[in-house]
Amino acid sequence: NKILVKQSPMLVAYDNAVNLSCKYSYNLFSREFRASLHKGLDSAVEVCVVYGNYSQQLQVYSKTGFNCDGKLGNESVTFYLQNLYVNQTDIYFCKIEVMYPPPYLDNEKSNGTIIHVKGKHLCPSPLFPGPSKP
């Protein structure tokens, strides 16, 4: 059994920031879960992780240098990304894993969201690929 994920097909990031809402066919209340956002058709870059442990405080982190935060709804996680660069325009996929209670569940791959970054004044050097893996 797989969780279904709904995302907006496209979002425009004005001012280098965007809110991306991942809506699930599953209630995350009182669950231990790991929600993540992945960049690229192959989902190669894990942009942001939101870890929830029952009703406790969410733990938010990025191993790839993205500035992010997460907000939890009953059946959604909203990722807020900041300081995006124009060359980070790409398709972004929501992923969800429910670790507890059993059984372990994850999602069917969603259609993804194209985030189009319209930078206001940021002009990073062409050599800068955006936040990189440490």
Partner: antibody, heavy 122, light 107 residues
Framework: EVQLVESGGGLVQPGGSLRLSCAAS????????MHWVRQAPGKGLVWVSR????????SFADSVKGRFTISRDNAKNTLYLQMNSLRAEDTAVYYC???????????????WGQGTLVTVSS | EIVLTQSPATLSLSPGERATLSCRAS??????LAWYQQKPGQAPRLLIY???NRATGIPARFSGSGSGTDFTLTISSLEPEDFAVYYC?????????FGQGTKVEIK
């Protein structure tokens, strides 16, 4: 006047615990993200942790993840840092700092408290 | 994470002289760079944010410039109270990181 005042520092043995507090005044505390930044004796500044305005999400430096927790009481205008499994390398002055702008995480730190010294030694 | 390298480590100058402090990032941080001043026994104080914007109450003798990887803090004419340690900090990438500091001391 915007003011942040830390307390709770002191001498603790390796493996021990300590809880730092930061009392805020002069601004609407519940509107701002808050941070902890530390400075080992004679060294530079290192970001430790942040918490969002309503306390529902937090982030940590890798060096303290799993050992430190951050929380806030918006009714009391107070920020906390619970430090467990302390190590000698956690010895530092711990500063609380407010995010410069309300409503989001801009990660400019302004203002700062005066700091509280945590010494981890046997 | 992004590494910020400040130079020089120590700057020995006299009051009235111009101070030029450098901060170099290991990769582009666009204009997401700030400067802080810290005096002995005191907390840091935000001077400049977004590379060139002076924080509230900061005198006009402090100015910031640069973008991408190279940034400069300039103190046009040093006052006695300006002798301190100065740190740069980036918020472009997670986590926020600081430079190791430049000490401006009296010659």
């Amino acid at each position: 006047e915007v003011q942040l005042v830390e307390s709770g520092g002191g001498l603790v043995q390796p493996g021990g615990s300590l809880r730092l507090s930061c009392a805020a005044s002069g601004f609407t505390f519940s509107n701002f993200w808050m941070h902890w930044v530390r400075q080992a004796p004679g060294k530079g500044l290192v970001w430790v942790s942040r918490i969002n305005s309503d306390g529902s999400s937090a982030s940590f430096a890798d060096s303290v993840k799993g050992r430190f927790t951050i929380s806030r009481d918006n009714a009391k205008n107070t920020l906390y840092l619970q430090m467990n499994s302390l190590r000698a390398e956690d010895t530092a002055v711990y500063y609380c700092a407010r995010d410069r702008y309300s409503g989001s995480f801009y990660n400019w730190f302004d203002p700062w408290g005066q700091g509280t010294l945590v010494t981890v030694s046997s | 994470e992004i590494v910020l390298t400040q130079s020089p480590a120590t700057l020995s100058l006299s009051p009235g002289e111009r101070a030029t402090l450098s901060c170099r990032a290991s990769q582009s941080v666009s204009s997401y760079l700030a400067w802080y001043q810290q005096k002995p026994g005191q907390a840091p104080r935000l001077l400049i944010y977004d590379a060139s914007n002076r924080a509230t109450g900061i005198p006009a003798r402090f100015s910031g410039s640069g973008s991408g990887t190279d940034f400069t803090l300039t103190i046009s004419s040093l006052e006695p109270e300006d002798f301190a340690v100065y740190y740069c900090q980036q918020r472009s990438n997670w986590p926020p990181t600081f430079g190791q500091g430049t000490k401006v001391e009296i010659k």
